[in-house]
Amino acid sequence: EPHSLRYNLTVLSWDGSVQSGFLTEVHLDGQPFLRCDRQKCRAKPQGQWAEDVLGNKTWDRETRDLTGNGKDLRMTLAHIKDQKEGLHSLQEIRVCEIHEDNSTRSSQHFYYDGELFLSQNLETKEWTMPQSSRAQTLAMNVRNFLKEDAMKTKTHYHAMHADCLQELRRYLKSGVVLRRTVPPMVNVTRSEASEGNITVTCRASGFYPWNITLSWRQDGVSLSHDTQQWGDVLPDGNGTYQTWVATRICQGEEQRFTCYMEHSGNHSTHPVPSGKVLVLQSHWQ
């Protein structure tokens, strides 16, 4: 998987008037990393792991850059002509990636009221837009503004691409959190369902990276997809992830069911606890 840095900026307008605040979130390798609050931007590390990336540094540079980007986006929103009354949002998502072969990718995407209307490959400078007439109108509007604005020249976009990669490389150099492997803690719980049935849930938490296999097996054979319910793999706020899988089984058959977990080449099997013990925790080495 490539290393990535993702900026998500959002600005709002109310009845055609652009609001002064904005929200910026930065994700590093898919994890919430920095955040700027709406009213006054102050880059805040999201959890201890983000602070560990660059130690006790001040985030002045990030704050300055993110504030500048927020101002640019507010100006862009002000130039969108078809703003109706009520609340509207303009979102810019900028992503840069460094792949294992050292190749890079950078892109920028604009969303109006949550709908994608314009994308740019920051390396090839190629623009793309969805087919809908609304998206096309918005895209023309924004592209014309960006062309007019001296700040938004090709040089500027090259700089955006270069700056993003430069920041990403700087964060990677710290080497504290990235390309690490944190094994999951797996715990199996049971709860009474309907007459004669119980629901068994297998939870994996605190793991990194996010790729994980979690499934229920009966006598060593995987249950079919439609007999299991899966939770999304979500960040848990500590620079790691969590997820779960559940299924319904007959009471008395618990010993035949196991939760199978595979993560970063390691695997483990977790039985259903007996009726008296509600939680069984296990941690593979």
Epitope: G220, V221, E262
Partner: antibody
Framework: EVQLVESGGGLVQPGGSLRLSCAAS????????MNWVRQAPGKGLEWVSY????????YYADSVKGRFTISRDNAKNSLYLQMNSLRDEDTAVYYC???????????????WGQGTMVTVSS | DIQMTQSPSSLSASVGDRVTITCRAS??????LNWYQQKPGKAPKFLIY???SLQSGVPSRFSGSGSGTDFTLTISSLQPEDFATYYC????????FGGGTKVEIK
């Protein structure tokens, strides 16, 4: 005595149908997941289909998907394999096999029937 | 689908020999591997589950090892009744058998 007895095999023309049965005795059939496994003359074992104890999970080998249907009747202690659109390459001895319930099992088949021969030929 | 490759496809051995049969999976299957013995005209017999656990009633001269992609079945001292065909089977992803290894008398 724990036993599985297959029946329903025979000679059938290509494109034809057959229904195999497997009668279980000597154990609580409803607790066990079951399989059909076949063996072409002079060849190795080929897994065909799996059905869990409650029939909620069913799997088929790619070679029979869409043509064969596995089912079970726990009240009758019976396993079935409905075979449609039969081909020459379906010619084989068909075994039913029980999945063991030993702790730490990995989908192993502990009890097998004696097999029933299915010949597809014009 | 996961392919299971057994080697050798056949071997000749004498009573008392130590025999090793290997089974390789096309991708990691953890320890979801079982071994069977089959004699001509008979149904297969279950020997080993979870790569290395001996089924009750199976002689201790049979043993299994391995995990991931490479597995072995070992017969420490071949007996006359051990001349047969041996199959591995995985249940990691659905179910598949290896092609078999025929153990013949030298």
């Amino acid at each position: 005595e724990v036993q599985l007895v297959e029946s329903g095999g025979g000679l059938v023309q290509p494109g034809g149908s057959l229904r195999l049965s497997c009668a279980a005795s000597g154990f609580t059939f409803s607790r066990y997941s079951m399989n059909w496994v076949r063996q072409a003359p002079g060849k190795g074992l080929e897994w065909v289909s799996y059905i869990s104890s409650s029939s909620s999970t069913i799997y088929y080998a790619d070679s029979v998907k869409g043509r064969f249907t596995i089912s079970r009747d726990n009240a009758k202690n019976s396993l079935y394999l409905q075979m449609n659109s039969l081909r020459d390459e379906d010619t084989a001895v068909y075994y039913c096999a029980r999945v063991s319930v030993i702790t730490g099992n990995t989908g192993a088949f502990d009890i097998w029937g004696q097999g029933t021969m299915v010949t597809v030929s014009s | 689908d996961i392919q299971m490759t057994q080697s050798p496809s056949s071997l000749s051995a004498s009573v008392g020999d130590r025999v090793t049969i290997t089974c390789r999976a096309s991708q990691s299957i953890s320890s979801y591997l079982n071994w069977y013995q089959q004699k001509p005209g008979k149904a297969p017999k279950f020997l080993i589950y979870a790569a290395s656990s001996l089924q009750s009633g199976v002689p201790s001269r049979f043993s299994g090892s391995g995990s991931g992609t490479d597995f072995t079945l070992t017969i420490s001292s071949l007996q006359p009744e051990d001349f047969a065909t041996y199959y591995c089977q995985q249940s990691y992803s659905i179910l598949t058998f290896g092609g078999g290894t025929k153990v013949e008398i030298k």
